[in-house]
């Protein structure tokens, strides 16, 4: 089955006398390992003898290697996939066909490889792109169908015999697909390289010349031009004549058209290599060049700057910037067409000459309002003096000046009054368009710059206004000095610090937060009765009868203000205790009797204790003691004791008499 063997190797290998040949080779014999290998040179099958005739360069069998040219020819392969060979050195008579006779367990195979050995090193081959254009990067390739591990070589690029500066990239291939050495050089040719000789030189490891290939560069480029002018400095006066000539120094391919350009624009009907300008005017000043085209494109000469000289034209003034803000810097520029450029300038402000200003520019570092007005200038060169133009207007803008806030009302102002204020200023540019007020409030502005405050508040202390154009200027605040009755009047207990107990020393203070004017009077009252006219109300020893609702009043020249009623509470132990009996202090046995412990206490009694005539405490602790049914034995004197957080109090004795019922008397 012939499909069992698969070989891969270059079809032909190239070398030269004394070099070497490296033959990359792979194979596959699916039925097993290689048993023997013979390398033939020009093997030929003899049908009569059924044998191969030819030189055996190498032999390796299962019985061992048979040396022939073993040192020169080497089989570098293995028994199953590699069949690489090396011949070093290689000789001219090695040219021809190499036959790899291989034998596996079941088959024999002959694989043929061509070997081309030349007498001398063959030249490399330079490959150029189909077209080379100036300034476009191209890759020059030098290819040599040779590479061998035992024979190092190098490829060098030369331009007109001189090594090229550009770095070349050399690559080698020793694969079953291809064997070569390649050098690639990236190169941006200029038009001046056209027709130059490029060489790729093959050298051995020591740099010794072996062979080379040369090509002549055909660099396509636009026409290269030179321009000549008479007069040579290209400076003339109006009415003079000028001649310009265009010369083509190089063009590839040949040029086809000629034209002239002024300031980048083509001049009509000028299609020869000479441009004649007669009786020139100042409008013909400019940059001239000639343009010649070929199939690659147009080529342009260097520009010639033709200067037609004339006296300054009427000047104009340019202001940077108007309107100008006060305090900013401003620059004035005198503009006048002239050739040569003006050498002297005269400046005018509102028609009056500005002394010491002779430059093209006038710089004012800090503009003031009086700098406003009309600025004009006159330019002068060697050919004469120009005329003064119309000039330019400088507008100096500034915020409103000397802004004041004025109170229109008669003084003093009282709380609740309507107050009118006006905002005044001295000057402004541009005009004032609006006003601002501080603080902000829900106030009327009946007209521009007037503020009306209805029902003015006691706390309206100061007002400031601003007059605004592009900027706002604030006036100093004015004090309204609003007068009002005392505010936030209240009663405050100074002592004691804790709750008031009967017998304590007590001081009450009449407080207020503010008053304008400050001179005030105080009044104390309890239940509509005047108690005092000081800021304090003092009790040396408070009694429960002093408890009640107190108020204080504070007045000034504007009005009087009362505090909220303040309740004075006095705490005392239970007092005035007595035992009351219901239905009375004489009750018939069998009925119901209720004893009540009555008292006066603050806070109220929280705990009651009952005692009998023997001062024995009874097991009852509520305010009422209920005896039901009442018995004769219950007769006797009773008293009670009341307790609160302040102390205790006791009642005097009260006697209960229980008498027999008629039934009991009847039974007796």
């Amino acid at each position: 089955d012939s499909s069992k063997w698969v070989f891969e190797h270059p079809e032909t290998l190239y070398a030269w006398e004394g070099a070497c040949v490296w033959i990359p080779c792979t194979y596959r014999a699916l039925d097993g390992d290689l048993e023997s290998f013979i390398l033939f040179h020009n093997p030929e099958y003899n049908k009569n003898t059924s044998k191969f005739d030819g030189t055996r360069l190498y032999e390796s069998t299962k019985d061992g290697k048979v040396p022939s040219e073993q040192k020169r020819v080497q089989f570098l392969g293995d028994k199953n996939k590699n069949c690489t060979l090396s011949i070093h050195p290689v000789h001219l008579n090695d040219s021809g066909q190499l036959g790899l006779r291989m034998e596996s367990k079941t088959e024999k195979w002959m694989e043929r490889i061509h070997l081309n050995v030349s007498e001398r090193p063959f030249p490399p081959h330079i490959q150029l792109p189909p077209e080379i254009q100036e300034s476009q990067e191209v890759t020059l390739t030098c290819l040599l169908n040779f590479s061998c591990y035992g024979y190092p070589i190098q490829l060098q690029w030369l331009l007109e015999g001189v090594p090229m500066r550009q770095a070349a990239v050399t690559s080698t291939s020793l694969t079953i697909k291809s064997v070569f050495t390649r050098s690639e050089l990236k190169f941006s040719p200029q038009w001046s390289h056209h027709g130059k000789i490029v060489t790729c030189q093959l050298q051995d490891a020591d740099g010794k010349f072996l062979s080379n290939d040369t090509v002549q560069l055909n660099v396509k480029h636009t026409p290269k031009l030179e321009i000549k002018v008479t007069p040579s400095d290209a400076i003339v006066r109006e009415g003079d004549s000028v001649t310009m000539t265009c010369e083509v120094s190089s063009s590839n391919p040949e040029y086809t058209t000629v034209s002239w350009l002024k300031d980048g624009t083509s001049l009509k009907k000028q299609n020869t290599f000479t441009l004649n300008l007669r009786e020139v005017t100042k409008d013909q000043s400019g940059k001239y060049c000639c343009q010649v085209s070929n199939d690659v494109g147009p080529g342009r000469s260097e520009e010639v700057f033709l200067q037609v000289q004339y006296a300054p034209e009427p000047s104009t003034v340019q202001i940077l910037h108007s309107p100008a803000v006060e305090g900013s810097q401003v620059e004035f520029l005198c503009m006048s067409l002239a050739n040569p450029l003006p050498t002297n300038y005269t400046w005018y402000h509102n028609g009056k000459e500005m002394q010491g200003r002779t430059e093209e520019k006038v710089h004012i570092p800090k503009i003031l309002p009086w700098h406003a007005g009309t600025y004009s200038c006159v330019a002068e060169n060697i050919l004469g003096t120009g005329q003064r133009g119309p000039g330019a207007e400088l507008d100096v803008q500034y915020p409103p000046k000397k802004v004041t806030t004025v109170i229109q009302n008669p003084m003093p102002i009282r709380e609740g009054d309507t107050v009118t204020l006006s905002c005044n200023y001295n000057s402004s540019n541009p005009s004032v368009t609006r006003y601002e007020w501080k603080p902000h409030g829900a106030w009327e502005e009946p007209s521009l710059g007037v503020l009306k405050i209805q029902n003015v508040g006691w706390d309206n202390t100061t007002i400031a206004c601003a007059a605004c154009n592009s900027w706002c200027s604030w006036a100093s605040p004015v004090a309204l000095n609003v007068q009002y009755a005392p505010r936030d009047v209240r009663v405050r207990k100074i002592k004691p610090l804790s709750e008031i107990h009967s017998g304590n020393s007590v001081s009450l203070q009449c407080d207020f937060s503010s008053s304008h004017p400050k001179e005030v009077q105080f009044f104390w009252e309890k239940n509509g009765r005047l108690l005092g006219k000081e800021s304090q109300l003092n009790f040396d020893s408070i009694s429960p009868e002093d408890a009640g609702s107190y108020s204080c009043w504070v007045n000034n020249s504007i009005g009087q203000t009362a505090s909220k009623a303040w309740t004075l509470e006095v705490l005392y132990a239970p007092r005035r205790l007595r035992v009351s009996m219901s239905p009375g202090d004489q009750v018939m046995e069998g009925k119901s009797a209720t004893l009540t412990c009555e008292s006066d206490a603050n806070p109220p009694v929280s705990h009651y204790t009952w005692f009998d005539w023997n001062n024995q405490s009874l097991p009852y602790h509520s305010q009422k003691l209920r005896l039901e049914p009442v018995k004769v034995q219950h007769s006797g004197a009773y008293w009670c004791q009341g307790t609160n957080s302040v102390g205790k109090g006791r009642s005097p004795l009260s006697t209960l008499t229980v008498y027999y019922s008629p039934e009991t008397i009847g039974r007796r």
């Epitope: 012939s2 099958y45 059924s50 044998k51 191969f52 034998e103 088959e107 024999k108 195979w109």
Partner: nanobody, 128 residues
Framework: QVQLVESGGGLVQPGGSLRLSCTVS????????MGWFRQAPGKEREVVSC????????YYPDSVKGRFTISRDNAKKTVYLQMNALKPEDTAIYYC?????????????????????WGQGTQVTVSS
């Protein structure tokens, strides 16, 4: 070890016929080529006829074409050479040879190249 045993040789008059047979043993391949070679005294060994076990392809040199016929019996691993119209120049020792198929870049040779294995030979004499 491969062994080839030839038989059928002898003395025959010119124009006569002989049938040689060769049996191979110790050869395990399914595909192989077998052939008959001859060597006359003082001459180089030459191919007489070959046959392939796989497709039965045959080869004859011009000197025997039309007179000799080679055939095979794969099961017995035996090859036969029928020789007719024998000539005195056919006198030689006839050897049987067997070998692996030999491919030259894909196409194979019908004859055993380099005589991988061959027998002791059988003498054929054509004389009146």
């Amino acid at each position: 070890q491969v062994q080839l045993v030839e038989s059928g040789g002898g003395l025959v008059q010119p124009g006569g016929s002989l049938r040689l047979s060769c049996t191979v043993s110790g050869f395990s391949l399914d595909y192989y080529v077998m052939g008959w070679f001859r060597q006359a005294p003082g001459k180089e060994r030459e191919v007489v006829s070959c046959i392939s076990s796989s497709d039965g392809a045959t080869y004859y040199p011009d000197s025997v074409k039309g007179r000799f016929t080679i055939s095979r019996d794969n099961a017995k691993k035996t090859v036969y050479l029928q020789m007719n119209a024998l000539k005195p120049e056919d006198t030689a020792i006839y050897y049987c040879a067997v070998d692996k198929p030999f491919y030259d870049g894909g196409s194979y040779y019908t004859c055993p190249v380099d005589f991988g294995s061959w027998g002791q030979g059988t003498q054929v004499t054509v004389s009146s």
